[in-house]
């Protein structure tokens, strides 16, 4: 990896698990410079592989609310608005980092956790399994 | 929101900015219980709205490497393998949390940051703007 010169103004850590345990400021900085007003908002409905969004809530997690996509059909919507089963709708998944309260119910102590979320769906050509 | 009873075994925080600054264990727990062997691995190529993945690296961020999807075409791939410009390939974006070293170059002090990433692409019916 890239070696970073240490800033002399860094806070000191007395934690015996250092550098495993770090200090994190929860005052979120939003770097979304994207000013495009048309984001993924209505793609779920206009897609040829449409999906629904389901609210996943967990008070022991930060962020506590995550939206999960579920593809509406196994096939894809064709030009006539019907489902075409010669094509497959599949979820696009991403591994994201969240904070899990640890020990449980603690307001100021967390552990990083990796979870797999489904963000939306895409239409793919099926894999054809040839029988020998 | 849901009120969580505080665990008496929680670590104490002397930080003057508490509860804005919290302790986070970076020993990642992987909660991906999904045993589905077929994940999004080859969807980028098989999709009717195919995409390429670009590596975005930033040593001041955790995770330092994030993969960004960029749609290959403005249109979508039709049954003949040609690009159909009557349909649009669009990126599916998601806001994710990352940790930003703050102050810069500090190994044990971070600030939560929200960034918008493109995870993949989907094929949508275009919005038709009727001229009055």
């Amino acid at each position: 990896g890239i070696t970073i010169p240490r800033n002399p103004g860094c806070p000191n850590s007395e934690d015996k698990n250092f550098p495993r345990t770090v200090m994190v400021n929860l005052n979120i900085h939003n770097r979304n410079t994207n000013t495009n007003p048309k984001r993924s908002s209505d793609y779920y409905n206009r897609s040829t592989s449409p999906w629904n969004l389901h609210r996943n809530e967990d008070p022991e997690r930060y962020p506590s609310v995550i939206w999960e996509a579920k593809c509406r059909h196994l096939g894809c919507i064709n030009a006539d608005g019907n489902v075409d089963y010669h094509m497959n709708s599949v979820p696009i998944q991403q591994e994201i980092l969240v904070l899990r309260r640890e020990p449980p119910h603690c307001p100021n102590s967390f552990r990083l956790e990796k979870i797999l979320v489904s963000v939306g769906c895409t239409c793919v050509t099926p894999i054809v399994h040839h029988v020998a | 929101g849901i009120t969580i009873p505080r665990n008496p075994g929680c670590p104490n925080s002397e930080d003057k900015n508490f509860p804005r600054t919290v302790m986070v264990n970076l020993n990642i727990h992987n909660r991906n219980t999904n045993t589905n062997p077929k994940r999004s691995s080859d969807y980028y190529n098989r999709s009717t709205s195919p995409w390429n993945l670009h590596r975005n690296e930033d040593p001041e961020r955790y995770p330092s490497v994030i993969w960004e999807a960029k749609c290959r075409h403005l249109g979508c791939i039709n049954a003949d393998g040609n690009v159909d410009y009557h349909m649009n390939s669009v990126p599916i974006q998601q806001e994710i949390l990352v940790l930003r070293r703050e102050p810069p170059h500090c190994p044990n002090s971070f600030r939560l940051e929200k960034i918008l990433v493109s995870v993949g692409c989907t094929c949508v019916t275009p919005i038709v703007h009727h001229v009055a």
């Epitope: 449409p50 629904n52 059909h73 196994l74 | -």
Partner: antibody, heavy 124, light 113 residues
Amino acid sequence: QVQLQESGPGLVKPSETLSLTCTVSGFSLPSHSVSWIRQPPGKGLEWIGIIWNQGGTDYNSAFKSRVTISVDTSKNQFSLKLSSVTAADTAVYYCARNMYITDYYYENYFMDAWGQGTLVTVSS
Amino acid sequence: DIVMTQSPLSLPVTPGEPASISCKSSQSLLFSENQKNYLAWYLQKPGQSPQLLIYWTSTRQSGVPDRFSGSGSGTDFTLKISRVEAEDVGVYYCQQSYYTPYTFGQGTKVEIK
């Protein structure tokens, strides 16, 4: 516990609109989708349509021009409207909850909880 | 529409004995992306609404006794009851949830001999 209860008139005149309500309790509306299914006397089950958690709908093409499914989340109620009915629409009408599976990334069209059903007779 | 054909349509059974119902689909119910078969079994007891027994061909719904088991793939599926009990009487339906509209078999009536 999970409960679904259908209600509405038991008798509808031909060419009129059949209107039924399904009141639900014991589960989260934002998570689950609800289907309507019917069963003509002495016959099998026929899926009419679904309303997804976000309010979108999908209908059996056999009913498409006549059917509307809607939701009133404030009342925990779903409704089915079937227009231009004939004697062939006489049936027991069920509302049913579509199964929700957490780590599964498709909508589910298996029904894991059903109402008790309501008989609607179409006759003049 | 996908046609689901069950056999037999009537099945007289003896308590304690096994029973088997067949369901055939006019098209394959196997989804290539996840290798799941989109087939379910329901039981409608006399005077009641249907209840889900099995989904994805062989996954038992919670609370369903383990004497019920499902098998098959593609277009041919089977529901087996290892030892029939008196409470198992009713009409059994298979249902496909791959293709819209989601269709049911015509039903198999299981009754005690």
